[in-house]
C-alpha cells in the first residue's frame, strides 16, 4: 500500500504518500479553529507508470496506452485512497465545541 | 458535473473530461478484441483551483493551501469520478463471445 | 473450460537440445499472456519469462535470459520453451501459466518434468 | 531485478488463523499475488490483484498490504490448507518474481 510505513521510509518517484504539515492559520488563512493549530494532512504525488498501484481497469488501460505512447498527454494521477478525519476545538462565542472534520488527512494513495 | 456535456461543449482549461479514443490493435496492442475496433475511452485532466469540483474535504484544503502558497508542489490532481464498462466481442476458436469489461470508460471527473 | 496442457516427461543428455509445448484452449489464446515457471527437485517457483502470443513480444528474466527461448504458434493455440544445449542443472518441472497483461497467472499447466543425465 | 522475502514455515493450531508475509521494496506499488501448491500438484492462483480472490477460492482466504509487506490470511485454517504457499509481483515492465515459498502447518 502507497502508505506512510512504504512512503515514508523508501525514495519514491512514483506516485506515494507525501508528508504535509499545514498550519491552519499560516497556510489556510482559518483563525477559528482553537486546537491543534495544525496537522499532518500529507499528500499524493508521483508518477503512475503501468500498473503501479492502478485503482481501475480504466487506470490499466490509460498506463498502458501511455506506455505505448509516451508522448500522450493522457495518463492515471496519482490521488488519494484512504482519508481519515481530524478532531478539532473551536468556540462559538464563549462556547467549546468539538467536532469531526471527515476526510482530512490522507492515509494512502492510488493510480486513478 | 465535469461530463461530456459541459467539458465537450467549453474551452476549459480546469480539470475537465477529455476525449481519448483508443484503438484496441494500435494503442494497447491487443488483437483479441474482435469487435469494437477501438472505443472512446475519455480521460481527466486540468488545473484544480480551489473548490473546482473538489472531491473530499482533503482535496479543498489542498487547493486553498496551494492558493495560498503557489510555489508548493502539493495540489490537488484531476481523476475520474464515474466510468462505465464496455461491451465486447472476441472469439474463442470460431465461438464468438460476449463479454463486458468493467471501469473502461470515463464519463465525469472530479478534484482529488 | 480453460485447459492448459503440457507436453509430456522428457529424459534427455547434456548437450542435447528440446522443445517443449503448452497448448492452451477454451479461452481467447492471444488475449492472455503465457509464463513458463521453474521448479527445481525441493525447490520454489522461479519465473523464467513470458510471451504476450498476439505480438510474440516476449521478456525474459534475467536468470534466464540467452539460457532459453520462448515462442508461440497462435494459429495453434500452443507455447513453446526450448533449450539448445542441455545441462544437468536444468532437470526441474517446468509449467507454464495463462497470465493477463494484469500481472497474475491464473491458469497453471499440468507440469512437464524434464530430466537430463549422462 | 528484486526478492521477496518470506518466512520458511508457518505452523497454526487447526481452525485458528494463519498469516503468511511476504515482504519486497517493489510491494507498496506493485500488487502481490500469492498461490498454493500441494504435493506433486501444479500451483493454484488464491489472491490476485489488491485482494481479490477466483472463484472456488473459499472466502477464508484473504489478502492485505501494508508498507512494503503483503500478507496472505487464512482464517478457520483447514487440514486441506496443508501447503506450500508463494507470493509474486513484477514491476512496470512486468518482470515477474516469485518469494521463497512458506510451507503452511495445520496442526491437530
Known amino acids: 500500500a502507497l502508505d506512510a510505513a512504504y512512503c515514508f521510509r523508501n525514495v519514491q518517484d512514483n506516485c506515494c504518500l507525501r508528508p504535509l504539515y499545514i498550519d491552519f492559520k499560516r497556510d489556510l488563512g482559518w483563525k477559528w479553529i482553537h486546537e491543534p493549530k495544525g496537522y499532518n494532512a500529507n499528500f499524493c504525488a508521483g508518477a503512475c507508470p503501468y500498473l503501479w498501484s492502478s485503482d481501475t481497469q480504466h487506470s490499466r488501460v490509460l498506463s498502458l496506452y501511455n506506455t505505448i505512447n509516451p508522448e500522450a498527454s493522457a495518463s492515471p494521477c496519482c490521488v488519494s485512497q484512504d482519508l481519515e478525519p481530524l478532531t478539532i476545538l473551536y468556540y462559538i462565542g464563549k462556547t467549546p465545541k468539538i467536532e469531526q472534520l471527515s476526510n482530512m488527512i490522507v492515509k494512502s494513495c492510488k493510480c486513478s | 458535473a465535469l461530463d461530456a456535456a459541459y467539458c465537450f461543449r467549453n474551452v476549459q482549461d480546469n480539470c475537465c473530461l477529455r476525449p481519448l479514443y483508443i484503438d484496441f490493435k494500435r494503442d494497447l496492442g491487443w488483437k483479441w478484441i474482435h469487435e469494437p475496433k477501438g472505443y472512446n475511452a475519455n480521460f481527466c485532466a486540468g488545473a484544480c483551483p480551489y473548490l473546482w469540483s473538489s472531491d473530499t474535504q482533503h482535496s479543498r484544503v489542498l487547493s486553498l493551501y496551494n492558493t495560498i502558497n503557489p510555489e508548493a508542489s502539493a495540489s490537488p490532481c484531476c481523476v475520474s469520478q464515474d466510468l462505465e464498462p464496455l461491451t465486447i466481442l472476441y472469439y474463442i476458436g470460431k465461438t464468438p463471445k460476449i463479454e463486458q469489461l468493467s471501469n473502461m470508460i470515463v464519463k465525469s471527473c472530479k478534484c482529488s | 473450460q480453460v485447459q492448459l496442457v503440457q507436453s509430456g516427461a522428457e529424459v534427455k543428455k547434456p548437450g542435447e537440445s528440446l522443445k517443449i509445448s503448452c497448448k492452451g484452449s477454451?479461452?481467447?489464446?492471444?488475449?492472455?499472456?503465457v509464463a513458463w515457471v521453474r521448479q527445481m527437485p525441493g525447490k520454489g517457483l522461479e519465473w523464467m519469462g513470458w510471451?504476450?502470443?498476439?505480438?510474440?513480444?516476449?521478456r525474459y528474466s534475467p536468470s534466464f535470459q540467452g539460457q532459453v527461448t520462448i515462442s508461440a504458434d497462435k494459429s495453434i493455440s500452443t507455447a513453446y520453451l526450448q533449450w539448445s544445449s542441455l545441462k544437468a542443472s536444468d532437470t526441474a518441472m517446468y509449467y507454464c501459466?495463462?497470465?493477463?497483461?494484469?500481472?497474475?497467472?491464473?491458469?497453471w499447466g499440468q507440469g512437464t518434468l524434464v530430466t537430463v543425465s549422462s | 531485478s528484486y526478492e521477496l522475502t518470506q518466512p520458511l514455515s508457518v505452523s497454526v493450531a487447526l481452525g485458528q488463523t494463519a498469516r503468511i508475509t511476504c515482504s519486497g521494496d517493489?510491494?507498496?506499488?506493485?500488487?502481490a499475488h500469492w498461490y498454493q501448491q500441494k504435493p506433486g500438484q501444479a500451483p493454484v492462483l488464491v489472491i490476485y490483484?489488491?485482494?481479490d480472490r477466483p472463484s472456488g477460492i473459499p472466502e477464508r482466504f484473504s489478502g492485505s498490504n501494508s508498507g512494503n509487506t503483503a500478507t496472505l490470511t487464512i482464517s478457520r485454517a483447514q487440514a486441506g490448507d496443508e501447503a506450500d504457499y508463494y507470493c509474486?509481483?513484477?514491476?512496470?515492465?512486468?518482470?515477474?518474481?516469485f518469494g521463497g515459498g512458506t510451507k503452511l502447518t495445520v496442526l491437530g
Open positions: 477454451g479461452y481467447s489464446f492471444t488475449r492472455y499472456y
Open positions: 490483484d489488491k485482494s
Open positions: 517493489n510491494l507498496g506499488g506493485y500488487y
Open positions: 501459466a495463462r497470465m493477463l497483461a494484469w500481472g497474475w497467472f491464473d491458469y
Open positions: 509474486a509481483s513484477y514491476d512496470s515492465s512486468l518482470m515477474m518474481v
Open positions: 510471451i504476450d502470443p498476439g505480438t510474440s513480444n516476449t
